[in-house]
């Protein structure tokens, strides 16, 4: 029997990608392993090669189609299997019935830009990437601003409880360099999690006019 603590976690980006991480204590680093995807009601199946990401974990992306194609729906179930080569044969190490819309993690928001900046305020917009039209407006966002002398972990989270792809940051300090990040999450799905944070957007507030506070 398989020994050691195992974990097989996958997320669907809501369009055409399932990303998986397989970890097992005591597994051999040079073992060749794959993830196989078998949908219950579709004619395609897909495989990806698991590549090491740390001492005891491997990851891969199942590319189901072109980035914006809608390959799965809420009624689909995809049986995902981790298969590892043992000599001349393949051995199944893990299996799960994956419900894509219960396990969502969207791509990080993109195209962050400063719409307008003042001494104390900055208006920023962004776009969501490869998100299913099924969500309509059922998305939420979290944002954070990095102030000088602080870390991202210390930055307070701002929550936008609706599909709002802009924010107006207030009470900023004049002539100061900031960075901004945002992430997105669908409201749907028992095991759904936040997207990765966007690439940071750097901006600088305008200096205060001379003779004014």
């Amino acid at each position: 029997a398989v020994n050691g603590t195992s974990r097989f976690t996958c997320f669907y980006n809501s369009r055409a990608n399932i990303s998986c991480v397989w970890s097992q204590d005591g597994a051999l680093q040079d073992t060749s392993c794959q993830v196989h995807a078998w949908p219950d009601r579709r004619r395609w199946n897909q495989t990806c090669e698991l590549l090491p990401v740390s001492q005891a974990s491997w990851a891969c992306n199942l590319i189901l189609g072109t980035p914006d194609s809608q390959k799965l729906t809420a009624v689909d179930i995809v049986t995902l299997r981790v298969m590892c080569r043992e000599g001349v044969r393949w051995r199944m190490m893990a299996i799960q019935d994956f419900k894509p819309f219960e396990n969502l993690r969207l791509m990080a928001p993109i195209s962050l830009q400063v719409v307008h900046v003042e001494t104390h305020r900055c208006n920023i917009s962004w776009k969501i990437s490869q998100a299913s039209h099924y969500f309509e407006r059922h998305l939420e966002f979290e944002a954070r601003t990095l102030s000088p002398g602080h870390t991202w972990e210390e930055a307070p989270l701002m929550t936008l409880k609706q599909k709002q792809e802009w924010i107006c940051l207030e009470t900023l300090t004049p002539d100061t360099q900031y960075e901004f990040q945002v992430r997105v999450k669908p409201l749907q799905g028992e095991f759904t999690t936040w997207s990765p944070w966007s690439q940071p957007l750097a901006f600088r507030t305008k200096p205060a006019a001379l003779g004014k506070d």
Epitope: T79, V82, M92, A94, I95, Q96
Partner: nanobody, 125 residues
Framework: QVQLVESGGGLVQPGGSLRLSCAIS????????IGWVRQAPGKQREGVSC????????YYADSVKGRFTISKDSAKNTVYLQMTSLKPEDTAVYYC??????????????????WGLGTQVTVSS
């Protein structure tokens, strides 16, 4: 070689209950994903419930959710399927199955490595 022996089947009236048992020998229960799979006459095998090894997460087919409960007793190396509010459409041979892997599947019951011989459950008035 792992061996699975089911018991507890029988004839029960609609709305009644049964508890199926699956005794495992030749291996440790905690080393396997365990499932209950049923097959009605003239139909394909259907995953009913399963339990993932190591994290003991449980899964149920929509048709039995809220009525059936899978559990295990590691000391006795036995898995149970408590079936309540039974319906005529639950009539089938119920098989216990084990997979030498992390996790389990209801959708693809053919992925199990070891099978019991089955126990008949008949729901009829």
């Amino acid at each position: 070689q792992v061996q699975l022996v089911e018991s507890g089947g029988g004839l029960v009236q609609p709305g009644g209950s049964l508890r199926l048992s699956c005794a495992i020998s030749g291996g440790t229960l905690d080393s396997y994903g365990i499932g209950w799979v049923r097959q009605a006459p003239g139909k394909q095998r259907e995953g009913v419930s399963c339990m993932s090894r190591s994290d003991d997460r449980t899964y149920y087919a929509d048709s039995v959710k809220g009525r059936f409960t899978i559990s295990k007793d590691s000391a006795k190396n036995t898995v149970y399927l408590q079936m309540t509010s039974l319906k005529p459409e639950d009539t089938a041979v119920y098989y216990c199955a084990a997979v030498d892997a992390y996790g389990c599947s209801l959708v693809q019951p053919t992925t199990y490595d070891f099978w019991g011989l089955g126990t008949q459950v008949t729901v009829s008035s």
